[in-house]
């Protein structure tokens, strides 16, 4: 025999059940929106201090490079790979061709202002790149010098100089006070090393390692 | 679109999907009890109303032969 | 954790949530369903069982005096 | 010891022109990058131009540009300097100068006396 | 081009005192540890001769009471204790780039 609830009873279980199902709803919303919070604000913060960090490096470029040009490397939004507008890309560096007749000294100067170096050509397929970008009637400074006149010769960002990686001109280097190299073109040999005189005024090739944001 | 504004579209539908479903399925149970009282009250206690098996999230309808 | 990996967990949880709620809500309309048909049985025809009212996306228990 | 001996300067009419030669001893001069520079009575020095050793560059200032030519005979240890054109702002005391190199830029080690060319009509 | 600016134009000292020449550049004439400025000394109807190479560097021959100093754009040539000898015109020189260029020059005179 099942005892008979009283109408009050039951009104009052009711109740009871409403507010037990109504707060789970709350909770399981609650923790919906705590999981949804967290993953809109959190990537949001993390995004914005991504992008402070960003912009705080842009700034540090902005003085010599008012504008960049960016590509996405792989998948992922986050990394971006840049050069100096003007400047080429080639694997993990930028180039830049300064037309202006300077000495090898003022050349190298001018490429540290942007924030890089005259060119190390460390590959084949590196010159192969460069020598498209460069006019046949003109020679173009390297950051390779022998100041010693000693021929040690030896690249301005310190790595070291590699005898089987080089391409000098048949004959070159040929005179102990030509200190400083150019990249030129011979018509017999293409394009090739040479050494001269470090002030005489030539064009320059300046290379950057990419900026990544 | 890029693949994290996909994730972050997805992630909104789900929500609130997610919400919805929450209400309907709450709707749905106070309902299923209600409905189990008035069916008790109307018959004149030929039914003994919802019984909660073993806490389940669910309940299902009870039927039972009213005490004679 | 990365930014789009957060995104993707919370994927995962709220696809997860989603399921499980849809399930439950789905099992629990089968049971009124199938109580209702029970119901209408045993009792001889007392109770019609449910009726879809609007086509709603939840149902109630309609009782009601079967015709005489 | 090194010794570097100037000749050639003299008295000329504008447009007119000189050669100065420089005769060198003492050394390899074939080894040598070699320089004029010039001295206008009163006033301080004025390079002219330079040869490099192996006479594969020249250099001049844009003062004479296309009027002078630096040139050397490494068999006879000279060097020359070939004026045309000359104008009275090119009056001075002419030098020959070796060369020597230092890290990325060079000195004048030695220097001739000097050889007088007055530009006047 | 690079011009190179000398002060005093005139110095007026005596025997046995010490002298202090500069030399200006306009713009930097060093390269990292290289600082390429020259100084040399000319005295009436004579050729110039080299004192000081590379700003420190004493050419050999020349009396250790010479000395040079500096780096970027200014330079210094010092004689501890002027000798009667040492009284003449001294130059100061550039060659980091072309052209090469000369101050006007200090003329150190007996007072």
């Known amino acids: 025999m099942v005892p008979e609830e009283e109408p009050q009873d039951r009104e009052k279980g009711l109740w009871w059940f409403q507010l037990k199902v109504w707060s789970m709803a709350v909770v399981s919303i609650l923790l919906l929106s705590v999981c949804f919070t967290v993953s809109s604000v959190v990537p949001h913060n993390f995004m914005y201090s991504k992008t402070v960090k960003r912009l705080s490096k842009l700034r540090e470029y902005q003085q010599y490079h008012p504008s960049l040009t960016c590509v996405m490397e792989g998948k992922d939004i986050e990394d971006w790979s840049c050069c100096p507008t003007p400047w080429t890309s080639f694997q993990s560096s930028c180039y830049f061709i300064s037309t202006g007749m300077q000495s090898w000294t003022k050349s190298q100067k001018n490429c540290s202002v942007m924030g890089a170096d005259l060119v190390v050509i460390n590959t084949r397929e590196e010159q192969d790149f460069i020598i498209q970008n460069l006019k046949r009637n003109s020679s173009y400074f390297l950051g390779l010098s022998d100041p010693g006149g000693r021929r040690h010769w030896q690249w301005v960002d310190q790595t070291p100089y590699n005898e089987n990686v080089t391409f000098w001109h048949s004959g070159e280097p040929n005179n102990l006070d030509e200190r400083c190299a150019i990249i030129n073109f011979r018509s017999s040999e293409e394009w090739g090393w040479n050494d001269i005189h470090c002030h005489v005024p030539q064009k320059s090739i300046c290379k950057m390692k990419k900026i990544y944001i | 679109l890029g693949e994290p504004q996909l994730c972050y579209i997805l992630d909104a539908i789900l929500f609130l999907y997610g919400i919805v479903l929450t209400l309907l399925y709450c709707r749905l149970k106070i309902q299923v009890r209600k409905a189990a009282i008035t069916s008790y009250e109307k018959s004149d206690g030929v039914y003994t109303g919802l019984s909660t098996r073993n806490q389940e999230t669910y309940e299902t309808l009870k039927h039972e032969k009213p005490p004679q | 954790l990365g930014e789009p990996q957060l995104c993707y967990i919370l994927d995962a949880i709220l696809f997860l949530y989603g399921i499980v709620l849809t399930l439950l809500y789905c099992r629990l309309k089968i049971q009124v369903r199938k109580a209702a048909i029970t119901s209408y049985e045993k009792s001889d025809g007392v109770y019609t069982g449910l009726s879809t009212r609007n086509q709603e996306t939840y149902e109630t228990l309609k009782h009601e005096k079967p015709p005489q | 010891e090194v010794q570097l001996v100037e000749s050639g300067g003299g008295l000329v009419k504008p447009g007119g022109s000189l050669r100065l030669s420089c005769a060198a001893s003492?050394?390899?001069?074939?080894?040598?990058?070699m320089s004029w520079v010039r001295q206008a009575p009163g006033k301080g020095l004025e390079w002219v131009s330079t040869i490099s050793s192996g006479d594969s560059y020249t250099y001049y200032p844009d003062s004479v540009k296309g009027r002078f030519t630096i040139s050397r005979d490494n068999a006879k240890n000279s060097l020359y300097l070939q004026m045309n054109s000359l104008r009275a702002e090119d009056t001075a005391v002419y030098y020959c100068?070796?060369?020597?190199?230092?890290?990325?830029?060079?000195?004048?080690?030695?220097w001739g006396q000097g050889t007088t060319v007055t530009v006047s009509s | 081009e690079i011009v190179l600016t000398q002060s005093p134009a005139t110095l007026s000292l005596s025997p046995g005192e010490r002298a202090t020449l500069s030399c200006r550049a306009s713009?930097?004439?060093?390269?990292?540890?290289?600082?390429?400025m020259h100084w040399y000394q000319q005295k009436p109807g004579q050729a110039p001769r080299l004192l000081i190479y590379g700003a420190s560097n004493l050419e050999s021959g020349i009396p250790a009471r010479f000395s040079g100093s500096g780096s970027e754009t200014d330079f210094t040539l010092t004689i501890s204790r002027l000798e009667p000898e040492d009284f003449a015109v001294y130059f100061c020189q550039q060659s980091i780039e072309d052209p090469p260029t000369f101050g006007g020059g200090t003329k150190v005179e007996i007072k």
């Open positions: 713009e930097s004439v060093s390269f990292r540890t290289s600082h390429l």
């Open positions: 100068a070796r060369q020597i190199y230092y890290d990325y830029a060079y000195y004048f080690d030695f």
């Open positions: 003492g050394f390899t001069f074939s080894s040598y990058g």
